[in-house]
């Protein structure tokens, strides 16, 4: 498979690997995104690790109010994440790839 | 890098070894998307590669109607791709990394 | 500390549309707070109506959907309800009322609530 | 919606009793309730949410317990100013839902 092909993949199973850990496992539960976060998005996470800070974000995540996160959700934060990745990306544009 | 952080780097990477082809290299034109499309992802292509079919995506994916993809528009592209791979991920639950 | 104003007219005539607005005060329009609207019959029961939040994200009561709007402004730290199509069963106090991101997101806030009655 | 029940509808009591009042939930709500308390004239308080969590400024004779569709709140030893309607708010799902208010009164 091409690398955006395994990409999203990634996100597909990574969603997955945490969401079927506790009650409904098409869904992420508070400590659920909890471990996603710390062990799959550590660079994002930084020190942020505080009960108030992963609260704010959960709630921020859940759309539809259910206190879980569903995989519309999520994806929508790696959106954000990854929109916060490309402003990162545009103001250094020595950076990349290529010029035109 | 996690492979999660990975794929988020890959989503950004891709889009603008594409973007940066022609025009403003912070969007996508159409054939830049077209080209994006061919090379990276073949699997969710597949055969569909008439006229109509691209220019019928490229206006779903133009959101802000400037006959150009943005970063944005491309991630929600992305997400929707992604919703269905979990879509089919989920119709199959023997492929479940864990069960509840 | 956080405080919440409702304000808006008193008497609405049936058929025509309420409209309030909540002022926020000690606290800005954060992503992190939903803003509700609840009100209360005066048989006491209350019925929530639905709150706006983080991205402009809205949720409506199903009952209520098709005759309800909520806005909010963000540079006034106000957010409004609009109930179009008014009877008398829409008499009530109308609550506007912070929603804390803790677990079960509950109303941490409340304004004091202004009485609406529906009546020609 | 989550049709949310709660009893008694009132009930007589003196300072310093024990005062328990239930609530049930038409399906399971996960801990996710949270309580009131409404004395004449004015808005709601929060009390506790997510079941036993006590919210700020909140005096330790509340509790709250539960699981599943049945909770229940607690006052240890009821004083002067507890005389009030209390109300069940179940935050599990869209729409919030109330129950019917349990009215607190001096025996």
């Known amino acids: 498979a091409c690398p955006l092909e395994k990409a999203l993949d990634v996100m597909v199973s990574t969603f997955h690997k945490y969401s079927g850990k506790e009650g409904d496992k098409f869904k992420l539960n508070k400590s659920e995104l909890k471990e996603l976060l710390t062990r799959e998005l550590p660079s994002f996470l930084g020190k942020r690790t505080d009960e108030a800070a992963f609260q704010k974000l959960m709630s921020n995540l859940d759309s539809n109010r259910d206190n879980e996160v569903d995989f519309q959700e999520y994806c929508v934060f790696l959106s954000c994440i990854a929109m916060m990745c490309n402003e990162f990306f545009e103001g250094f544009p020595d950076k990349q790839p290529r010029k035109k | 890098a996690c492979p999660l952080e990975k794929a988020l780097d890959v989503m950004v990477s891709t889009f603008h070894k594409y973007s940066g082809k022609e025009g403003d290299k912070f969007k996508l034109n159409k054939s830049e998307l077209k080209e994006l499309l061919t090379r990276e992802l073949p699997s969710f292509l597949g055969k569909r590669t008439d006229e109509a079919a691209f220019q019928k995506l490229m206006s779903n994916l133009d959101s802000n109607r400037d006959n150009e993809v943005d970063f944005q528009e491309y991630c929600v592209f992305l997400s929707c791709i992604a919703m269905m791979c979990n879509e089919f991920f989920e119709g199959f639950p023997d492929k479940q990394p864990r069960k509840k | 500390q956080v405080q919440l104003q409702e304000s808006g007219p008193g008497l609405v005539k049936p058929s025509q549309t309420l409209s309030l607005t909540c002022t926020v005060s000690g606290d800005s329009f954060t992503n992190d707070y939903y803003w509700n609207w609840i009100r209360q019959f005066p048989g006491k029961k209350l019925e929530w109506i639905g709150h706006i939040g983080y991205g402009g994200n809205i949720n409506y009561n199903p009952s209520l959907k098709n005759r309800l709007s909520m806005s909010r402004d963000t540079s006034k730290n106000q957010f409004s309800l609009k109930l179009s199509s008014v009877t008398a069963a829409d008499t009530a106090v109308y609550y506007c009322?912070?929603?804390?991101?803790?677990?079960?997101?509950?109303?941490?806030?409340w304004g004091q609530g202004t009485l609406v009655t529906v009546s020609s | 919606d989550i049709q949310m029940t709660q009893s008694p509808s009132s009930l007589s009591a003196s300072v310093g009793d024990r005062v328990t009042i239930t609530c049930r939930a038409s399906q399971d709500i996960r801990n996710y309730l949270n309580w009131y308390q409404q004395k004449p004239g004015k808005a709601p308080k929060l009390l506790l949410y997510?079941?036993?969590r006590l919210h700020s400024g909140v005096p330790s004779r509340f509790s709250g317990s539960g699981s599943g569709t049945d909770y229940t709140l607690t006052i240890s030893s009821l004083q002067p100013e507890d005389f009030a309607t209390y109300y069940c708010?179940?935050?599990?799902?869209?729409?919030?839902?109330f129950g019917g208010g349990t009215k607190v009164e001096i025996k």
């Open positions: 009322t912070r929603e804390s991101f803790y677990d079960g997101y509950p109303f941490d806030y």
């Open positions: 708010q179940q935050g599990n799902s869209l729409p919030r839902t």
């Open positions: 997510y079941t036993s």
